[in-house]
Interface confidence: low
């Protein structure tokens, strides 16, 4: 399913975090967390849907607590008072490494998925109408939250593309926040009139089911392999796309390609058996000179999930891996607007594609 | 019971055009990955074309590239191969096949992968004036 | 393109032989690469994907495994109806596939 009229995600907002949910919460919602657990401090974070600022109402408190071997509690709060907790005896999330966390509001319940795999339901005990506010809170240091409508009729392909109705600022600046942490680099909020959020539906209301025979369906965000789309009036200063995604554990490497016709402007290679990230360009099928310094030890590990956020400038493009700054890359074909197509392939899972 | 069925193949002229259809049965081609394997006489597997229906993707052998097209009819649950500008090294048993859907319980990555699970029995194409 | 060498093109073995097939990819390949049977007349059958795991209701005789970009298919104890051309197939970024040039395994 494509959706579309979703606002502009929050990029690497600091914790602890408040930002309206445009519209509240729909039936079909779905709201993307992506960071990182910090190993250092604090054994607890938490992801709140609730209404307002003040944290007195809350739908939906899902806070992970690495404390007594681990579990994960899910609560709502009333008028300041909390209700009674439902545990999960289950710790997705380790700390120091990146997660991708999945929220589907439905009419019963939220749905909730951490790297692609299915967690946990909450039945809501309050209309989740009411909900126009997520926050996040705790040890945890965050890529990405992003909001994924879907269209209220279905279509084919899956990364059909419509663009916003009205032009939205990229990203919207979270209310009454501190800078962001050094190491990323500041939002551009040049205006964007396109964004496009790629996503993968089983079937209406089966978004995560995982049948022991081969269903007929795509039981949880998975693309297939590559991954290829156009990026909607191509590249432009202030143009961001966002990658999440899981590395397979086998892994020997993959690919990001911004392609421009049968050139690659950009290719970048996560190389696990050379344990290095390339990145050149091609040019009527022939290779440039490759550029692998990084600033720090490779990002990408076997196993693990990443997100991968790519901001051109006028000059080059700049690559933060799990919410920060790896590398820039200058341009070596400068006709941004012709750079339109995306292309995924190689040893990940790719859980989300937003262009 | 899955399965698939091949048709359309024949004595067609070079330059002239064709075009496969592969019914398929006990599952839903919208959701799938279906593949176009072909096979010279004597000669070995020749990977043709690649669609996956629900994202519109469609992938090609550089042989083939601007030539064929894959496509598929959701409502007919049938894909189909249009192949045109046929020439004498395009004659061969063309099989369609379902890629088999990989699940990775313990990794959590599931998908249809082009390992090919499900064959038709495949239909001859031969170009020849 | 990623090219999938495969050795030996024919193999002469009695019934009850041990039988390793062997393909070597051009490049990593990591472990997308499958293996497919076919008997004259019929269209193949998938008998091991991801190199290594066993495709369902094919005989536990059969195995695949990978050491670097040398993948090998083995059949323990070779059975009357394993004679047949065996295939190894790659997908490494999946795009475009190939398929190795056939094993004939024939009656000694």
């Known amino acids: 399913m494509a959706f579309s009229g979703s606002q502009a995600p929050y990029l690497s907002p600091a914790v602890p975090f408040s930002g309206t949910i445009q519209g509240g919460l729909q039936d079909g919602l779905q709201i993307t967390v992506n960071g990182t657990v910090l190993s250092s401090s604090g054994t607890r974070f938490a992801v709140n849907f609730q209404t307002g600022f003040s944290g007195n109402d809350i739908a939906f408190h899902f806070n992970p607590r690495f404390e007594d071997g681990g579990y994960v509690v899910c609560n709502t709060r009333q008028n300041g008072s909390w209700g009674p907790e439902e545990r999960k005896t289950h710790m997705p999330f380790q700390k120091g490494m990146p997660f991708d966390l999945c929220f589907l509001v439905q009419s019963s319940d939220f749905k909730v998925m951490v790297n692609g795999i299915l967690f946990v339901q909450y039945f809501h005990r309050v209309p989740f109408h009411r909900v126009d506010t997520i926050s996040v809170n705790g040890s945890v240091q965050l890529s990405y939250i992003s909001f994924q409508n879907p269209r209220t009729v279905p279509v084919q392909p899956a990364f059909s593309t419509v663009p916003f109705s009205q032009p939205v600022c990229f990203p919207p600046r979270p209310r009454g926040r501190r800078q962001k942490p050094p190491g990323v680099w500041p939002a551009n909020p040049a205006p964007i009139t396109q964004t496009v959020i790629h996503t993968v539906q089983s079937a209406p209301g089966q978004m995560f089911s995982t049948p022991a025979i081969p269903p007929m369906m795509y039981p949880h965000p998975a693309y297939p392999m590559p991954f290829i789309t156009t990026i909607l009036g191509g590249l432009y200063p202030s143009k961001s796309i966002l990658l999440s995604g899981t590395v397979l554990p086998s892994a020997q490497r993959f690919h990001i390609n911004l392609c421009s016709g049968n050139h690659i402007a950009f290719h970048l290679n996560p190389r696990f058996d050379e344990n290095a990230v390339v990145r050149n360009t091609q040019i009527d099928n022939s290779w440039g000179s490759e550029e692998r310094s990084l600033p720090r030890k490779m990002p990408f590990v076997r196993g693990q999930s990443f997100s991968v956020w790519i901001l051109c400038e006028a000059h080059c493009l700049k690559v933060a891996v799990d919410g920060q700054h790896l590398f820039e890359y200058y341009h070596r074909l400068r006709n941004l607007p012709t750079i339109n197509r995306l292309e995924v392939g190689g040893d990940i899972q790719l859980t989300h594609v937003q262009t | 019971e899955v399965q698939l069925v091949e048709s359309g193949g024949g004595l067609v002229q070079p330059g002239g055009s064709l075009r496969l259809s592969c019914a398929a049965s006990?599952?839903?081609?919208?959701?799938?990955?279906i593949h176009w394997v072909r096979q010279a006489p004597g000669k070995g597997l020749e990977w043709v074309a690649s669609?996956?229906?629900?994202?519109?993707?469609?992938y090609y052998a550089d042989s083939v590239k601007g030539r064929f097209t894959i496509s598929a009819d959701t409502s007919k649950n049938t894909a189909y191969l249009q192949m045109n500008s046929l020439r004498a090294e395009d004659t061969a048993v063309y099989y369609c096949?379902?890629?088999?859907?990989?699940?990775?319980?313990?990794?959590?990555?599931?998908?249809?992968?082009?390992?090919?699970?499900?064959w038709g029995q495949g239909t001859l194409v031969t170009v020849s004036s | 393109d990623i090219q999938m060498t495969q050795s030996p093109s024919s193999l002469s073995a009695s019934v009850g032989d041990r039988v390793t097939i062997t393909c070597r990819a051009s490049?990593?390949?990591?472990?997308?690469v499958a293996w497919y049977q076919q008997k004259p007349g019929k269209a193949p059958k998938l008998l091991i994907y991801?190199?290594?795991s066993l495709y369902s209701g094919v005989p536990s005789r059969f195995s695949g495994s990978r050491s670097g970009t040398d993948f090998t298919l083995t059949i323990s104890s070779l059975q009357p109806e394993d004679f047949a051309t065996y295939y190894c197939?790659?997908?490494?970024?999946?795009?475009?596939?190939?398929f190795g040039q056939g094993t004939k395994v024939e009656i000694k």
């Open positions: 096949a379902r890629g088999h859907y990989q699940e990775g319980r313990k990794s959590g990555f599931s998908y249809w992968s082009p390992a090919l699970d499900y």
């Open positions: 006990g599952f839903t081609v919208s959701y799938s990955s």
């Open positions: 669609i996956y229906s629900y994202y519109g993707s469609t």
């Open positions: 490049q990593s390949v990591s472990s997308a």
């Open positions: 991801s190199a290594s």
């Open positions: 197939q790659q997908w490494y970024w999946y795009y475009p596939v190939t």
